[in-house]
Amino acid sequence: HSDGIFTDSYSRYRKQMAVKKYLAAVLGKRYKQRVKNK
């Protein structure tokens, strides 16, 4: 996941926010799956 060539603060910020959203979605799915399997 390189997200392009820009290294300015805004590009870095947008990438960081994307990672946070992605991880939240993945962890949320895993949590729901665990609850479902109980």
Epitope: S2, G4, I5, F6, S9, Y10, S11, R14
Partner: antibody, heavy 110, light 111 residues
Amino acid sequence: SVEESGGRLVTPGTPLTLTCTASGFSLSRYAMGWVRQAPGKGLEWIGDISTYGTTDYASWVNGRFTISRTSTTVTLKMTSLTTEDTATYFCARDYWLSLWGQGTLVTVSS
Amino acid sequence: AAVLTQTPSPVSAAVGGTVTIKCQSSQSVYDNNALAWYQQKPGQPPKLLIYAASNLASGVPDRFSGSGSGTQFTLTISGVQCDDAATYYCLGGYDDAADNAFGGGTEVVVK
């Protein structure tokens, strides 16, 4: 280069999906954004999608548009279209929109 | 959503002269510098000129320069050429991307 496709004449309320493809670089390595321009008007930022598939939209979108991606395409799905959505729709590379396609024209008319 | 207000059109410039276009945001952009400038000619897509307020995009002549911080930004074209006749847009990036928006555009006429 970047190329948009899928624009056509539709009636109000008809859903429409636009597609963005790339040549000369790997689309999967870049965040991609969508921008539109009504005839004779200015540019309007719609939203973008990260390499992780997470999305951000302009506040005015209100859930009517959805951006998604595969390894080779980025799509813009539009619903509840009105005549106000008549515009040329551009796909552009990365958060700074550094490389643009020629655009695809969407005309919404009854 | 943020509102970006640009210098009213048209702005007239003489070949070899200097043009200044201003962009004012209703709220501070991210890190006080998340602002870009684009050039668009009739029938063509926009072209990135400046990003992060003052960074020249790849392949853009250095007669284009950007400055400013927070809510006030400026695009300057020095040694204006006929080829610079176009409409110029600013784009602001914000803490919440839902606020991202373009300015209304400024047309530059070269005489």
